[in-house]
Amino acid sequence: ATKLTEEKYELKEGQTLDVKCDYTLEKFASSQKAWQIIRDGEMPKTLACTERPSKNSHPVQVGRIILEDYHDHGLLRVRMVNLQVEDSGLYQCVIYQPPKEPHMLFDRIRLVVTKGFSGTPGSNENSTQNVYKIPPTTTKALCPLYTSPRTVTQAPPKSTADVSTPDSEINLTNVTDIIRVPVFN
């Protein structure tokens, strides 16, 4: 059975989820990346994507979601601002990288948002103030940004081994210091 690891974030309404998903720098720096939610019994829902090709350190905002791809560090930074209770759920970072074989990583983000004022932010970077100002360089982006005809595809974790498939996604690992909750299926 495939072992999936969940990394749990417990935050309050109004706070900001701040996730850093790492990837293999040489392979995927310019690949389009996406942020998805996986609701119980449903297919993954793509919520936001970087541009294609992904631009370095160029914030893309879709609603309350901000994606920034740091090519130099091999990091996709995902922020969800002004969190609401209904944002609670299981999320994952993915890379659109056809037609190469997937490099499988299995960490997903379990977000739990509870009611209550977030208070004064402390040293935890996830505890951000209620009001969040989007940087002026942020662009509004359709997701995904495809050229025509559309050919970009992905694939979720299938096994711990590398699996050769013509069209695939790469699930990225979140590398912030948080609780790991192993989940087995």
């Epitope: 297919m43 309350r64 992905q154 694939a155 069209d167 695939s168």
Partner: antibody
């Protein structure tokens, strides 16, 4: 260019099992950006989603048909299939296979195949 | 299940005139975090499969003429054909893909007056 093509018998007897196959060409079924599904349209009526499957075999069914539906995938043949058991005349419809992707909905469709349930 | 209700059932419009189709969902299909509505519009011509026109309620699919536009949010949506062309004669369906089971509206038949 990705194409989907449905195949299977056009006539099925009541109480039997309807079996259809969708062959994917011009692209790989082995990708979970896409889910592969079945939709049907009774004569002169609207569209009804039957269910969808991922390349890894995760299935999602319409509760109204769940007890009678099985969708399966064969990645080696780049195909996915529909089985609908205990059919009645109400299952007479054009059956479409389609590709689903969450930002888009169902963006590529097969031409459809007509299935008539009759003795 | 989310029930999708379309109106009118049929619509006769003169060539070059505007056609407006409405779609109402029984619950919101707006996803809060990205402010996107998971609603699509399809065009189906006789003897053909449906063709995706609009996704995310207002984004035109690649290759779709700009006379087609989608608007609305939450539970109320509109497909507008700004200037009807002969090839636009078809049945149009809205569909929610926010939650399972995916559901379609009953369709609106657009004809030339």
């Amino acid at each position: 260019q990705l194409q989907l093509q449905e195949s299977g018998p056009g006539l099925v007897k009541p109480s039997e099992t309807l079996s259809l196959t969708c062959t994917v060409s011009g692209g790989s079924i082995s990708s979970s950006s896409y889910y592969w599904g079945w939709i049907r349209q009774p004569p002169g009526k609207g569209l009804e989603w039957i269910g969808s499957i991922s390349y890894s075999g995760s299935t999602y069914y319409n509760p109204s048909l769940k007890s009678r539906v099985t969708i399966s995938v064969d990645t080696s043949k780049n195909q996915f299939s529909l089985k609908l058991s205990s059919v009645t005349a109400a299952d007479t419809a054009v059956y479409y296979c389609a590709r689903y992707y969450s930002p888009y909905g169902m963006d590529v469709w097969g031409q459809g195949t007509t299935v008539t349930v009759s003795s | 299940d989310i029930v999708m209700t379309q109106s009118p059932d049929s619509l006769a419009v003169s060539l070059g005139e505007r056609a407006t189709i409405n779609c109402k969902s029984s619950q919101s299909v707006l996803f809060s975090s990205n402010n996107k509505n998971y609603l699509a519009w399809y065009q189906q011509k006789p003897g053909q499969p449906p063709k995706l026109l609009i996704y995310w309620a207002s984004t035109r699919e690649s290759g779709v003429p700009d006379r087609f536009s989608g608007s609305g949010s939450g539970t109320d949506f509109t497909l507008t054909i700004s200037s009807l062309e002969p090839e636009d004669v078809a049945v149009y369906y809205c569909q929610q893909y926010d939650s399972l089971p995916f559901t379609f509206g009953g369709g609106t038949k657009v004809e030339i007056k």
